[in-house]
């Protein structure tokens, strides 16, 4: 079949195959990231809690990140979520201290339970805090020569609530 004449239009232009001269430059604050596009897309604006990480151009969209005190969530930083302190988690009512027996060593995410050392037949070497997991001590079996003395913490479980987010495009 015949080649689509619009395929000759480069990124940064749009194509109208109803016209003889088919390629036109994208207007200011719009872009086309591939050739042969029928329209240019409006540039993303990084406003409010969003901050411009990369300016828009005629061939690529702007990229946003979050202002200090917030962090990105979602593909392409589609949301900004409030940071909390270590030892806290974000709830619908804001940042709340981790309950006893849980910890969070980051500014984001949820409080996770301390590792249960006794499940592995180990003792608690260092007590847990709101900011740090417990450190498990050696079990009798570990006391044999050449054995490791510290067990790493259990892997984090997946977040169990929907974040309080601030959306924007």
């Amino acid at each position: 079949g015949l080649q689509d004449p619009c395929s000759n239009c480069p990124a940064g232009t749009f194509c109208d195959n109803n016209r003889n001269q088919i390629c036109s430059p994208c207007p200011p604050n719009s872009f086309s990231s591939a050739g042969g596009q029928r329209t240019c897309d409006i540039c993303r604006q990084c406003k409010g809690v969003f901050r411009t990480r990369k300016e828009c151009s005629s061939t690529s969209n702007a990229e946003c990140d979050c202002t200090p005190g917030f962090h990105c969530l979602g593909a392409g930083c589609s949301m900004c979520e409030q940071d909390c302190k270590q030892g806290q988690e974000l709830t619908k009512k804001g940042c709340k201290d981790c309950c006893f027996g849980t910890f969070n060593d980051q500014k984001r995410g949820i409080c996770r339970p301390w590792t249960n050392c006794s499940l592995d037949g180990k003792s608690v070497l260092v007590n847990g805090t709101k900011e740090r997991d417990v450190v498990c001590g050696p079990s009798p079996a570990d006391l044999s020569p050449g054995a490791s003395s510290v067990t790493p913490p259990a892997p984090a479980r997946e977040p169990g609530h929907s974040p309080q987010d601030i959306e924007g495009r």
Epitope: A11, C23, S24
Partner: antibody, heavy 114, light 107 residues
Framework: EVQLVESGGGLVQPGGSLRLSCAAS????????MHWVRQAPGKGLEWVSY????????YYADSVKGRFTISRDNAKNSLYLQMNSLRAEDTAVYYC???????WGQGTLVTVSS | EIVMTQSPATLSLSPGERVTLSCKAS??????VSWYQQKPGQAPRLLIY???NRYTGVPARFSGSGSGTDFTLTISSVEPEDFAVYYC?????????FGGGTKLELK
Amino acid sequence: EVQLVESGGGLVQPGGSLRLSCAASGFTFSEFGMHWVRQAPGKGLEWVSYISSGGSTIYYADSVKGRFTISRDNAKNSLYLQMNSLRAEDTAVYYCARDWVDYWGQGTLVTVSS
Amino acid sequence: EIVMTQSPATLSLSPGERVTLSCKASENVGSYVSWYQQKPGQAPRLLIYGASNRYTGVPARFSGSGSGTDFTLTISSVEPEDFAVYYCGQSYSYPLTFGGGTKLELK
């Protein structure tokens, strides 16, 4: 801050050649198509040429086709206009501009006269 | 090529007045029209794009309207620094073309 700085203009005899340069800074040059636009003394604006961001697509005004060649070096953030077989009617201030035509350089004057 | 015709060629007025500049395209250019301001010895400055969108940093007294073939640039209350030449231009198709300009001069 976006900046476009043209250079290379001057006085040249009819039939002669000149090469104009446009140095870009303050934006991602390789992501923008670029234009040359000229303005004869006391006259209006006339579009001259366009080159796409990667250099694969080029357009010229009929008045310069076959005589002028537009090119770019993205590694040097530079745009060029090679002007051959110059005529008196090519006398103008030559501006480079981004393809959004939002930022222009200050221009460089080309005078074609014997 | 698409011909852009501006009128009037010259406009004499006083600061504080409202002014409307006209630009007509020889064929339909949708809304792909920009307006530029140029002062002596300076490069053109983009004021309006897409017929009605004010560019970053352009004062609110400047506004654009129109689509198809008829376009206008309005300055709601002319300031002393607005006396300059104004050009319309179309980016609907190559070659890009500009109007001949309207000179705003002090009465």
